[in-house]
């Protein structure tokens, strides 16, 4: 994978609630950062930004948790454990609309990839997903 | 193509590192279809502490 | 009981919009995607696209994209499928259908509405 | 897109006869959804991820295949199991749908 800057969002998406933050195009991220507490106040996902009706409310329910004796990744004394992921999306071109957070495809994948994992891993503890980044391949 | 590059977070001690790859590989035909992405090359590794967004620079898969 | 009651026929004319609804009960409407697919007289079954009530996000087929737009109202439980630019292939019975997200995805989609006539003649 | 192919496009056949449809991918699919269709109705789920049946299915369908082929057999037809029938697949964006075998009475 090249090397290249790329567009990148701080934003935390998460189960239950979730945190808008501005998103620049820079190289570096803004750190992740943990909610104080897990809330269940329904609210939108991140960056949303599909037409929608004026009067629709979105929201995502925080699942059952589940506990397990699984050795994980060092943690913060907040409790959480961070995995950093990477994969490749074969049928999608990068192109310069990928560095720019403000771009609709660039909304559009990071709106895909926030719900893919939302769904994915709702069954366990899991919290969220920050810093996604987009780089060509 | 597109490489994608992000950080998961967990309760702690509720999944590590093979099952958040198991997880998302599991998913990956699904996802194909439902958000027409055709995944591939998946790395997963710890975050290494304490977390910075920095530490993403070191990670090339 | 699960159930998707769509709106009624309609008749338009080349070149107008249709805004077809699809109100849903007896399970939680934010939980499941909603698809739109669509039969010409005669014809397969086409894919329209889906929306998911739970974030509002929603996808095309790359046919469509351009003249179909997807809503929904969480509040009033009900999704609607608007196509415009209306042609005379548009004549279809619309249908909206439930399914599933992760990891349940594979249960495909399970109940559908009675299917809305839509009818483009000049 | 990926191309479903059923076959044949309609049969007749008998209550009591044993049934085979057929669906065929222009390329692999990890499993297919069949439907059942009768006239002026919507559709309704019959078979999903290839071979496990629906709520209230009878117990004489079953479903089959892997890769390109799948089959939706009828052990022995009933009177109200004359309808048409699709197959979808889901494996690749956007989801395809066969053009259908109707099945008729001889």
């Known amino acids: 994978a090249s090397g290249s800057a790329s567009g990148s969002a701080s934003t935390l998406v998460h189960n239950g609630t979730s945190a808008r933050a501005t998103t620049t195009p820079a190289s570096k991220s803004t750190p992740f950062s943990i909610p104080s507490h897990h809330s269940d106040t329904p609210t939108t996902l991140a960056s949303h930004s599909t037409k929608t009706d004026a009067s629709s409310t979105h929201h995502s329910s925080v699942p059952p948790l589940t506990s397990s004796n699984h050795s994980t990744s060092p943690q913060l004394s907040t409790g959480v454990s961070f995995f950093f992921l990477s994969f490749h999306i074969s049928n999608l071109q990068f192109n310069s609309s990928l560095e720019d957070p403000s771009t609709d495809y660039y909304q559009e994948l990071q709106r895909d990839i926030s719900e893919m994992f939302l769904q994915i891993y709702k069954q366990g503890g899991f919290l969220g997903l920050s810093n996604i980044k987009f780089r060509p391949g | 193509s597109v490489v994608v590059q992000l950080t998961l977070a967990f309760r702690e001690g509720t999944i590590n590192v093979h099952d958040v790859e198991t997880q998302f590989n599991q998913y990956k035909t699904e996802a194909a279809s439902r958000y027409n992405l055709t995944i591939s090359d998946v790395s997963v590794s710890d975050v290494p502490f304490p977390f910075s967004a920095q530490s993403h620079h070191h990670h090339h898969h | 009981e699960v159930q998707l009651v769509q709106s009624g026929a309609e008749v338009k004319k080349p070149g107008a919009s249709v805004k077809v609804s699809c109100k849903a009960s007896g399970y939680t409407f934010t939980d499941n995607y909603i698809n739109w697919v669509r039969q010409a007289p005669g014809q397969r079954l086409e894919y329209i696209g889906w929306?998911?009530?739970?974030?509002?996000?929603?996808k095309f087929n790359e046919k469509f994209k351009g003249r179909v737009t997807l809503t929904v109202d969480t509040s009033a439980r009900t999704a609607y499928m608007e196509l415009s630019s209306l042609r005379s292939e548009d004549t279809a019975v619309y249908y909206c259908a439930r399914d599933y997200p992760f990891p349940s995805y594979h249960y495909g989609m399970d109940y559908w509405g009675q299917g809305t006539t839509v009818t483009v003649s000049s | 897109d990926i191309q479903l192919t059923q076959s044949p496009s309609s049969l007749s056949a008998s209550v009591g006869d044993r049934v085979t449809i057929t669906c065929s991918a222009s390329?692999?699919?990890?499993?297919i959804h069949w439907f059942q269709q009768k006239p002026g109705k919507a559709p309704k789920l019959w078979i999903y991820s290839t071979s496990n049946l629906a709520s209230g299915v009878p117990s004489r369908f079953s479903g089959s295949g892997s890769g390109t082929d799948f089959t939706l057999t009828v052990s022995s037809l009933q009177p109200e199991d004359f309808a048409t029938y699709y197959c979808?697949?889901?494996?690749?964006?956007?989801?395809?749908f066969g053009g259908g075998t109707k099945v008729e009475i001889k």
């Open positions: 979808q697949q889901r494996s690749s964006y956007p989801p395809t």
């Open positions: 390329s692999s699919v990890s499993y």
């Open positions: 929306i998911y009530p739970g974030s509002g996000n929603n």
